[in-house]
Interface confidence: medium
Amino acid sequence: KVFGRCELAAAMKRHGLDNYRGYSLGNWVCAAKFESNFNTQATNRNTDGSTDYGILQINSRWWCNDGRTPGSRNLCNIPCSALLSSDITASVNCAKKIVSDGNGMNAWVAWRNRCKGTDVQAWIRGCRL
């Protein structure tokens, strides 16, 4: 599923991401935009043999199990394919674990490079939340 901007903002808010670990909803929507272009089925392969999955591009080396990433830790204890569902529950729950891990949203390269320090509230402007 490819979410609309406000549709995703509403879904993320429903799942409790607004101000989760101090990150406003705009940060999460911005991260999703530049990680996956709001596409729940996005997959991207990395040079280390791992793959990033879903709307928040969660990595198979650390967070989920895709059955083919050597040394996968599967810290979210889920199959990576669960992160590709049109229901973003699994991605949100895993993202909460990731953002609590110590580096905050710096874990997402796209957030670090495209969202951090910008007017992230623009990503939810005009949305009825």
């Epitope: 089925q41 083919r68 990433t69």
Partner: antibody, heavy 116, light 107 residues
Framework: QVQLQESGAEVMKPGASVKISCKAT????????IEWVKQRPGHGLEWIGE????????YYNEKFKGKATFTADTSSNTAYMQLSSLTSEDSAVYYC?????????WGQGTTLTVSS | DIELTQSPATLSVTPGDSVSLSCRAS??????LHWYQQKSHESPRLLIK???QSSSGIPSRFSGSGSGTDFTLSINSVETEDFGMYFC?????????FGGGTKLEIK
């Protein structure tokens, strides 16, 4: 136990298309990548590409882009590979395998012969 | 693409001999190297994964070693059922690639 069952041998004319199937049993089909591999005598094994059935995500070896197209039907636990604009170079045995990085589980292979 | 070069192309041995098959990668692939056996008109069978981990049901006479770019499959005391083709494969990067194979034949 995990099994991959491929469709039977095909004899096709040059220029035609063919669709090979790979039915999976014994595991959760949607969560594992299915890989496709080509084997021609004297050419060893070549990786064609892969599909994740649960999402339809696909990746192709550059060499096979435009030649192979992958699809999957999660209701029947079956992956498909269509090969188009067939030439004699496409005559080979085609395998599906479960993509665990290494390939522990293989189909029995589908022999494709392209001949006028 | 990562090239895998296997040597020798053919190995003629007598049952009971011990042999080593080589696989060399064009660049480092860490430990992401796997070995397969293939007999005539059969699908490949995984023998060794990640350089040295035996696949389920594989006899203990098969072992693997190496790291980086140089890898070896060893067969301790070859049995008649071991004759056939052996391929290495890397899963370090895409596209996945295979070696050209080593044919193990009876002398």
């Amino acid at each position: 136990q995990v099994q991959l069952q491929e469709s039977g041998a095909e004899v096709m004319k040059p220029g035609a298309s063919v669709k090979i199937s790979c039915k999976a049993t014994g595991y959760t089909f949607s969560t594992y990548w299915i890989e496709w591999v080509k084997q021609r005598p004297g050419h060893g094994l070549e990786w064609i590409g892969e599909i994740l059935p649960g999402s339809g995500s696909t990746y192709y070896n550059e060499k096979f882009k435009g030649k192979a197209t992958f699809t999957a039907d999660t209701s029947s636990n079956t992956a498909y590979m269509q090969l188009s604009s067939l030439t004699s170079e496409d005559s080979a045995v085609y395998y599906c395998a479960r993509g665990d990085g290494n390939y522990c589980y293989w189909g029995q292979g589908t022999t494709l012969t392209v001949s006028s | 693409d990562i090239e895998l070069t296997q040597s020798p192309a053919t190995l003629s041995v007598t049952p009971g001999d011990s042999v080593s098959l080589s696989c060399r990668a064009s660049q480092s692939i860490s430990n992401n190297l796997h070995w397969y056996q293939q007999k005539s008109h059969e699908s490949p069978r995984l023998l060794i994964k990640y350089v040295s981990q035996s696949s389920s049901g594989i006899p203990s006479r098969f072992s693997g070693s190496g790291s980086g770019t140089d890898f070896t499959l060893s067969i301790n005391s070859v049995e008649t059922e071991d004759f056939g083709m052996y391929f290495c494969q890397q899963s370090n990067s895409w596209p996945r690639t295979f070696g050209g194979g080593t044919k193990l034949e009876i002398k």
